[in-house]
Interface confidence: low
């Protein structure tokens, strides 16, 4: 067991032209945080594959507001180390992914505004217990400078943290066959206890309780020799007793995933999907707390302050699973309308709209009126893929190019006479009626029903309609 430690020194623009635009602005201040994901071996796995060695999330950095006009400087960083505890042996070779995330601080619409600024990855050889290794990685125009090391947690020592040390029983010497534990010379290497019955000649162990076979031997205790003779069945039950050299059990046979994990075969091995509260290559690591950074892809961990209480990962949009380890293809739901291109940015969905469409989901058709003018002060009204003109008074037709006869619709009620006027129409009302369209009867006593005539205007006078 031990801890991988990562120290971020700086994150900012790399050398050369094309300095990146600052991720924060005066209007939208933000802060950074980092996530590290570790995988054993020199695999070039996808960024979304499980972080079998573990993962960690940094604290949020200080709030940053860009100094206007200045180039993007090195951005303020969170305090402290990122620590990834590992329960198994340190593999010596490992792959890492370090992600720089931005958290926007303004009023955010539609959930937390996280966005991935940069992702760097690499494959390294590293012995546990060694000095800090320095590294520089570039992602686009950004540059990340960092150091890392792996250290063993007592009582483990060694380059793989597999040797166990115990205090010496006597000051001068260790037990038979055991050496002093360098660099802890006052401690002795403890014997590694393999699984009971594990063949001392053909089996070995790197962790207490296991039994791994040397080449040519098989069986749970490495006591069955492997034969090269032909076999009747490619994966038969007799292989363990006859010593047949067979393709062997499938990687998921016997389910190597502990604690209720489910196994799925991969081209060269297997992969365990672990229930909440467990992780590791075989779901063997339990007692996970938020301090272990179990939430991937920028998920936020809540609860789980101690190993007895469960933690919950709140996943950012685009990820799901108990540890936010699974990417959701939200574009498969085809949310963009009118032929828009769907972009899953992780923190948000974006639709890149075809010309003539706009809106968050390209739902607005802007094209109906494009390039089509309505004459004589008319305004274009969109709708249904066609355009129509709402014409100013006195004009009509599809494009408002025809001079309309405002009296054609016989707008004057109760026998009123209509006169065309440069600004519209005028109704000369028949006796007993008034109003812009002669719509109001005049009471016999001279009072109007609705509404009162303006001062100085007698019933029967022409009323100009505006």
């Amino acid at each position: 067991a031990g801890v991988f430690e990562l120290q971020i020194h700086s994150f900012g623009p790399g050398p050369g032209p094309g300095a990146p635009r600052s991720p924060c602005s005066a209007r939208l201040p933000c802060r950074l945080f980092f996530r590290v994901c570790l995988k054993p071996g020199l695999s070039e796995e996808a960024a979304e594959s499980p972080c079998a060695l573990g993962a960690a999330l940094s604290a949020r950095g200080p709030v940053y507001t860009e100094q206007p006009g200045a180039p993007a400087p090195d951005l303020p960083l969170p305090d402290g180390l990122l620590q990834v505890p590992f329960r198994d042996a340190w593999p010596g070779t490992f792959s890492f992914i370090i992600e720089t995330w931005r958290e926007e601080l303004g009023d955010q619409i539609g959930g937390p505004a996280w966005s991935l600024l940069a992702r760097v990855a690499g494959r390294r050889r590293l012995a546990a217990g060694g000095p800090w290794a320095r590294d520089i990685q570039r992602a686009g125009a950004w540059e990340l400078r960092f150091s890392y090391r792996a250290r063993c947690e007592p009582p483990a020592v060694g380059t793989a943290c597999t040797r166990l040390c115990r205090p010496r029983s006597a000051p001068s010497r260790c037990g038979p066959g055991l050496r002093p534990c360098a660099p802890l010379e006052d401690e002795c290497e403890a014997p590694l206890v393999c699984r009971a019955g594990c063949s001392p000649e053909h089996g070995f162990c790197e962790q207490p309780g296991e039994c791994r076979c040397l080449e040519g031997w098989t069986g749970p205790l490495c006591t069955v020799p492997v034969s090269t003779s032909s076999c009747l069945s490619p994966r038969g039950p007799s292989s363990a007793t006859t010593g047949c050299l067979v393709p062997g059990p499938g990687p998921c046979d016997g389910n190597p995933c502990a604690n209720g994990g489910s196994c799925s075969e991969t081209p060269r091995s297997f992969e365990c999907t672990c229930p909440r509260g467990f992780y590791g290559l075989r779901c063997e690591v339990s007692g996970v707390t938020c301090a272990d950074g179990p939430c991937f892809n920028g998920g936020l961990c809540v609860g789980g302050a101690d190993p007895d209480s469960a933690y919950i990962c709140h996943c950012p949009p685009g990820f799901q699973g108990s540890n936010c380890e699974k990417r959701v293809d939200r574009c498969s739901l085809q949310p963009c309308r009118n032929g828009g291109l769907c972009l899953d940015l992780g923190h948000a969905l974006r639709c890149r709209c075809r010309a003539g469409f706009a809106g968050p989901r390209c739902e607005h058709d802007l094209d109906d009126c494009a390039g089509r003018a309505c004459a004589n002060g008319g305004t274009c009204v969109e709708g249904g893929g066609a355009h129509r003109c709402s014409c100013a008074l006195g004009f009509g037709g599809r494009d408002c190019r025809e001079r309309a006869d405002p009296c054609a619709a016989r707008p004057c009620a109760h026998g009123g006479r209509c006169y065309a006027h440069f600004s519209g129409l005028v109704c000369a009302c028949a006796p007993g009626y008034m109003g812009a369209r002669c719509e109001f009867p005049v009471h016999p006593d001279g009072a109007s029903a609705l509404p009162a005539a303006p001062p100085g205007l007698r019933p029967g006078d022409p009323q100009r309609y505006l």
């Epitope: 635009r21 206007p68 619409i109 706009a358």
Partner: antibody, heavy 119, light 107 residues
Framework: QVQLQQWGAGLLKPSETLSLTCAVY????????WSWIRQPPGKGLEWIGE???????NYNPSLKSRVSISVDTSKNQFSLKLSSVTAADTAVYYC?????????????WGQGTLVTVSS | AIQMTQSPSSLSASVGDRVALTCRAS??????LGWYQQKPGKAPKLLIY???SLQSGVPSRFSGSGSDTDFTLTISSLQPEDFATYYC?????????FGGGTKVEIK
């Protein structure tokens, strides 16, 4: 088709409170900033302030002590109140939709309301 | 507040002319700038956002360029309907501020 329709009193006396409302028809109400902008006769445009569907506001400091913008998401409406008006507040007032996070983008505007302050 | 200065305040041009309007910010605003066209009695209309992105439905004769403090709106071939007043707007920082406008008149 997104449309912004605005209304409110057009003639005020000094010291009264200007009150305008803007209704949003078509399209989403959440996911945008909703702004008020004004333009004195023959002059340029001045941003007054904005509100989100969740009620978060930002105001122009030059007006902050007198301005209040509120939102009614159930009606897809937002409103402007400007207290203690003077003749200097005479202007055409516009409501507008601002798209968030994609640059300066007041892509839809109301028709404008002329507010005259006169004793 | 960030001051936005437009020049010239007015210009006379003919149909078919190439016209360039400039907008200068009192401090760096990245590319957080838009251009609007306004005709008398009408609300402004968005032409360009994010300094150089053409708003959907706007003719391609309009283009925007620049970043930081200096920005340009170019009309490659002036059309009769382009005679109007043009405003720039920064939304880099609060309060959002408009330029004073450039009036494009018929020569």
């Amino acid at each position: 088709q997104v449309q912004l329709q605005q209304w409110g009193a057009g003639l005020l006396k000094p010291s009264e409170t200007l009150s305008l409302t803007c209704a949003v028809y078509g399209g989403s109400f959440s996911g945008y900033y909703w702004s008020w902008i004004r333009q004195p006769p023959g002059k340029g445009l001045e941003w007054i302030g904005e509100i989100t569907h969740s009620g978060s506001t930002n105001y122009n400091p030059s007006l902050k002590s007198r301005v209040s913008i509120s939102v009614d998401t159930s009606k897809n409406q937002f409103s402007l109140k400007l207290s203690s008006v003077t003749a200097a507040d005479t202007a055409v007032y516009y409501c507008a939709r601002g798209e968030y996070g994609s640059g300066s983008r007041f892509d839809y505007w109301g028709q404008g309301t002329l507010v005259t302050v006169s004793s | 507040a960030i001051q936005m200065t437009q020049s010239p305040s007015s210009l006379s041009a003919s149909v078919g002319d190439r016209v360039a309007l400039t907008c200068r910010a009192s401090q760096g605003i990245r590319d957080d700038l838009g251009w609007y066209q306004q005709k008398p009695g009408k609300a402004p209309k968005l032409l360009i956002y994010a300094a150089s992105s053409l708003q959907s439905g706007v003719p391609s004769r309009f283009s925007g360029s620049g970043s930081d403090t200096d920005f340009t709106l170019t009309i490659s071939s002036l059309q009769p309907e382009d005679f109007a007043t043009y405003y720039c707007l920064q939304d880099y920082d609060y309060p959002l501020t408009f330029g004073g406008g450039t009036k494009v008149e018929i020569k």
